[in-house]
Amino acid sequence: SGRGEAETRECIYYNANWELERTNQSGLERCEGEQDKRLHCYASWRNSSGTIELVKKGCWLDDFNCYDRQECVATEENPQVYFCCCEGNFCNERFTHLPEAGGPEVTYEPPPTAPTLLT
């Protein structure tokens, strides 16, 4: 595989389940992986009746579906869990749902936060 052109070193981090998992709720995550593996950022969320519930954001290890994607775009039509991934530092800050079958594009803007670095 090898590292991608838009090398990912840091991603926006968020964990809705932070208390149970004993992690920070939000911040920045430094991505780590073997030299021959590509690194990505991801975002995952749920959409219940139009209400967006952010679930996770962070680093994601070598995945063909994320290669050369500069923006975080989920393409599945109506999944239980929405998921997008991308390459490039902090590319998961904003995320979009654009179903392959067509339909309205919805972009989610992050609220302003004071980032904390997670390693």
Epitope: S1, N15, N17, E21, T23, K37, V55, K56, G58, W60, L61, D62, D63, F64, N65, Y67, E76, Q80, V81, F83, C85
Partner: antibody, heavy 121, light 107 residues
């Protein structure tokens, strides 16, 4: 309804190459929504992921087998294949092919029935 | 590699019992875990993905929970067809790895 069927020799001699093919019916192997994988299960033991391939030919292998494994896809035949070289008795197992979701976390939702491969002289 | 440890390795239960199987990852895997059921001589069957999402066609008596390193598969009321071996599988890391399995036997 999507079905997967493994085929190949049930007996392979030590040091030779194990070759298996998985034929996909009821759906296209060229779909960008899925990956295709091989998993094995030694007698009385658990599951071991061998590797996965996407329609584009991008492959991922288990590092413990990487030097011996090749997975390839033939979209014209709607098949994907496994080659495992320099086999030993430790490679005796039931070999399964499976369809995996687009992302690894989707899991493997359709499996072949498995084929038993014995490595013995 | 991320090691997945299941407990117990086997459990004896009766029809109607509530059965709980646990899976622990050697490092945090967020919610990216799947559960499979395997009957003797058959291929595994996907039950749950992303820790708690029921795969289409799987009975609602199966449920999954947990995140981080500790996960649980629960069968709320064991049915005769549920006697099988159950495996967990982590997804975020490569290589993909499975737990050693938990065999649910008839008491």
């Amino acid at each position: 309804q999507l079905q997967l069927q493994e085929s190949g020799p049930g007996l392979v001699k030590p040091s030779e190459t194990l070759s298996l093919t998985c034929t996909v019916s009821g759906g296209s192997i060229s779909s960008s929504s899925y990956a295709w994988g091989w998993i094995r299960q030694p007698p009385g033991k658990g599951l071991e992921w061998i590797g996965s391939i996407y329609y584009s030919g991008s492959t991922y292998y288990n590092p413990s087998l990487k030097s011996r494994v090749t997975i390839s896809v033939d979209t014209s035949k709607n098949q994907f294949s496994l080659k495992l070289s320099s086999v030993t008795a430790a490679d005796t197992a039931v070999y399964y092919c499976a369809r995996a979701g687009k992302y690894r976390w989707h899991g493997m939702d359709v499996w072949g029935q498995g084929t038993t491969v014995t490595v013995s002289s | 590699d991320i090691q997945m440890t299941q407990s117990p390795s086997s459990v004896s239960a009766s029809v109607g019992d509530r059965v709980t199987i646990t899976c622990r990852a050697s490092q945090g895997i967020s919610s990216w875990l799947a559960w499979y059921q395997q009957k003797p001589g058959k291929a595994p069957k996907l039950l749950i993905y992303a820790a708690s999402n029921l795969q289409s066609g799987v009975p609602s008596r199966f449920s999954g929970s947990g995140s981080g390193t500790d996960f649980t598969l629960t069968i709320s009321s064991l049915q005769p067809e549920d006697f099988a071996t159950y495996y967990c599988q982590q997804a975020p890391d490569l290589p993909i790895t499975f737990g050693g399995g938990t065999k649910v036997e008839i008491k």
